[in-house]
């Protein structure tokens, strides 16, 4: 394994980070922030990448489906938590192709730095990010709940994952920002459910000494749809795009899928219809089962030990911050817009610390900060009691969940002895079956002077596709050492965030 | 390897819409990569006009946001390109092509098809 | 939008010959400078990707350098074959090309 020049490995960096955003389910995109190191291995005709990304949250659902790079800047009337992360990715691509690269695993750790950057000392507005956000379930159930009324096509829709809450304290009242998942539960159940997934971001406002907040003076919800199902035409014709259908009083993807179709088989979408989806293809077949079979290329991953999974991580306080990792078929989005104007014209960047009371627990007694060397952790646990979890991604959610036996996957890897197998609040321990590609870990708050703790490089060994020896792993272990000519440049416009990471300025 | 091949009509009257159809063999494109629309003026001069990911998500040229769309029928492994309200201006031989990641670099081309705008 | 330069529009050299042909952006463009041929009949092809590297399929007597905002696509020894428009486009932000630079047998 050989060091090599951060900036000669952008694009395989920007590919990579695309690819481990398309394996995740819930959370935000990763944008890329700097190549912090890399090194590369030279195995017959295939190039092994072992790449350390610094990354930042952005504030697009990774639902969206969206390249990190096109996620527009957030809405400035609304707190943008700054969540930091680093990623370890073990990468291929054949040598000669250019459009060719694969993600083998990656490992991420983020951290919120929102209350390390705040400067609260002149501010009239006081703005907190709750790391416990299920406590702000009620809140979203009751946006939710809200949008139902104005949007029948959301009838069936749950409140999934409760992703990130602000509140805001100034002169004119107090508002908590609320952006959660939601997932399609339709009562009738079909040998599949259709796999829809949304996005809302709730902004529910009550008066300075409110404590009731069970009733909010004022409520703005947004939701977007991302549908697994296709949202195209017929005849390749395009509608018209003067004249956008509507339906239900807000605009929609103009076309869809008839509802329960066999395959193939496409009407145009009628405006007025009510709005129902098929349900999607088995988990690993990404579309291809319309039409006739292509020649594929590579996959963006390579196929995982199960075919739908999900990482859960677990606090001791029983919240869960899990990441999906399932590699399923396309998601489309249709934005649905709420008629209600945002009430208060306060500006609230002004920082903010964070409830500390909050904080998830560290389960083994040493402090979450300490630098690990490395990147591994005391114990040979996951940093701060995350660990992986797998099971059928489309039968988990709000939704009732299946059966235990009904898992389609994975094999033998437990959590380590002793730890819990806690799903969330309500749910019964459910087996761990296998050893999932890639993870991401949220880890608590950063404070000022505190760096993020690398994510562990302890990958299992891989055999390499198409390789001669394919009993023979051929990924090295993770280098410890930094690239020469590493870390690259930070990307214009994150210059507040690059204290928290290590090796923070050029060689 | 991937091949693109270009389809529509060469002839468009000025104020309607044009469409293209670019059909895509050798390669799915639900699997990887961004497919692209771009055109060549009269005289040579290349314009970037938007792509569709493999993901389904969409990014345009900012100068034809208003007019542009780009969509896709993965059944028939097939990208469209809407234009509305087109002119004279138009004009132009369009190519689809395909780019690893964006617009980064287009690896493969389509042959590209003429469309004249004339009344 | 970052514009991109081809200063010479039209070159003549002999068969054989080493051919440079240099492409100026107006900003950094940290190594997104590719570069394309485009034949008489329209075919276009990617040479060259990210600066310096060869597309799979492509001669190496074809290379690429540069850096910042100056770019170069060397032709070691000229071909008949290699007569065509070559075209450099940047690709770190939205996608400009240059005005192309037509190569012809003197």
């Known amino acids: 394994v050989s060091p090599t020049d951060c900036s000669a490995v952008e694009p395989e960096a920007e590919k990579a980070l695309d690819l481990i955003n398309k394996r995740r389910r819930d959370g935000y995109l990763f944008q890329l922030l700097r190549i912090a190191d890399a090194h590369l291995d030279r195995v017959e005709n295939t190039t092994v990448y072992y790449l350390v990304l610094d990354v930042q949250e952005s504030d697009c659902s990774v639902l969206s489906r969206k390249y990190w790079n096109d996620c527009e800047p957030p809405d400035s009337r609304r707190p943008s938590e700054i969540v930091i992360g680093q990623c370890k990715v073990i990468a291929t691509r054949h040598s000669h192709e250019s459009q060719d690269l694969r993600v083998i695993d990656f490992n991420c750790t983020t951290s919120s730095v929102s209350s390390a950057l705040a400067n609260t000392k002149d501010s009239p507005v006081l703005i907190d990010f709750f790391e416990d956000t299920e406590r702000y379930r009620k809140q979203a159930n009751k946006a939710l709940e809200k949008y139902k009324e104005e949007n029948d096509d959301f009838a069936s829709f749950r409140v999934d994952r409760i992703e990130r809450v602000a509140r805001v304290r100034g002169g004119e009242g107090t508002g908590y920002f609320v952006d959660f998942s939601v997932r399609n539960c339709p009562r009738h159940h079909f040998p599949r459910h259709p796999n829809v997934f949304g996005f809302c971001r709730a902004d529910l406002f009550y008066d300075v000494e409110a404590l009731d907040l069970e009733s909010p003076k004022n409520l703005v919800i947004n939701c977007e749809v991302f549908d697994p199902q296709e949202h195209e035409n017929i005849n390749g014709v395009p509608p018209h795009l003067g004249h956008p259908f509507h339906w239900g009083g807000h605009e929609r993807s103009s076309t869809t899928k008839p509802p329960f179709k066999p395959h193939g088989s496409r009407d145009h979408h009628h405006p007025h219809k009510p709005h129902e989806h098929g349900p999607p293809p088995p988990p690993d077949e990404r579309d291809h089962s319309h039409g006739p079979p292509l020649p594929q290329g590579p996959p963006p991953l390579l196929p995982m030990s199960c075919s739908s999974c999900q990482h859960a991580t677990f606090g001791t306080n029983g919240a869960q911050r899990h990441s999906h990792n399932n590699n399923s078929s396309d998601l489309h989005p249709h934005k649905h817009h709420s008629h209600e104007q945002h009430p208060h014209g306060h500006h609230p960047h002004a920082h903010h610390p964070h409830e500390h009371d909050t904080h998830r627990q560290h389960p083994h007694g040493h402090h979450p900060h300490g630098h690990h060397p490395h990147g591994h952790h005391p114990h040979g646990h996951h940093p701060h009691g995350h660990h992986p979890h797998c099971h059928d991604f489309q039968d988990y959610g709000p939704c009732d969940p299946p059966p235990h036996n009904q898992g389609h996957c994975c094999h033998g890897h437990g959590p380590p002895p002793g730890h819990l197998r806690r799903r969330g609040p309500g749910k019964g321990p459910r087996p761990f079956h296998c050893r999932q590609i890639g993870s991401v870990y949220r880890l608590p708050p950063l404070r000022k002077g505190e760096v993020l703790p690398l994510p562990e490089a302890n990958f299992p060994s891989f055999p390499l596709p198409h390789h001669k020896h394919p009993l023979k792993p051929d990924n090295q272990p993770f280098p410890q050492s930094v690239s020469e000519s590493c870390p690259g440049k930070f990307k214009s416009g994150f210059p507040q965030v690059s204290m928290f990471f290590t090796h923070t300025f050029p060689k | 390897e991937v091949q693109l091949q270009e389809s529509g009509p060469g002839l468009v009257k000025p104020s309607q819409s044009l469409s293209l159809t670019c059909t895509v063999t050798?390669?799915?494109?639900?699997?990887?990569?961004?497919w692209n629309w771009i055109r060549q003026f009269p005289g040579n001069k290349l314009e970037w006009m938007g792509y569709i990911s493999y993901s389904g998500s969409t990014n345009y040229n900012p100068s034809l946001r208003s007019r542009i769309s780009i969509t896709r029928d993965t059944s028939k492994n097939q990208f469209f390109l809407q234009l509305i309200s087109v002119t004279t201006e138009d004009t132009a031989t369009y190519y689809c092509?395909?780019?690893?990641?964006?617009?980064?670099?287009?690896?493969?081309w389509g042959q590209g098809t003429l469309v004249t705008v004339s009344a | 939008d970052i514009q991109v330069t081809q200063t010479t529009s039209s070159l003549s050299a002999s068969l054989g010959d080493r051919v440079t042909i240099s492409c100026r952006a107006s900003q950094d463009i940290s190594n997104y400078l590719n570069w394309y041929q485009q034949k008489p009949d329209g075919t276009v092809k990617l040479l060259i990707y990210?600066?310096?590297r060869l597309h799979s399929g492509v001669p190496s007597r074809f290379s690429g350098s540069g850096s910042g905002t100056d770019y170069s696509l060397t032709i070691s020894n000229l071909e008949q074959e290699d007569i065509a428009t070559y075209f450099c486009q940047q690709g770190n932000t939205l996608p400009t090309f240059g005005g192309g630079t037509k190569l012809e047998i003197k």
């Open positions: 092509g395909s780019a690893s990641y964006r617009y980064a670099w287009f690896a493969y």
């Open positions: 990210y600066t310096s």
């Open positions: 050798g390669y799915s494109i639900t699997s990887d990569y961004a």
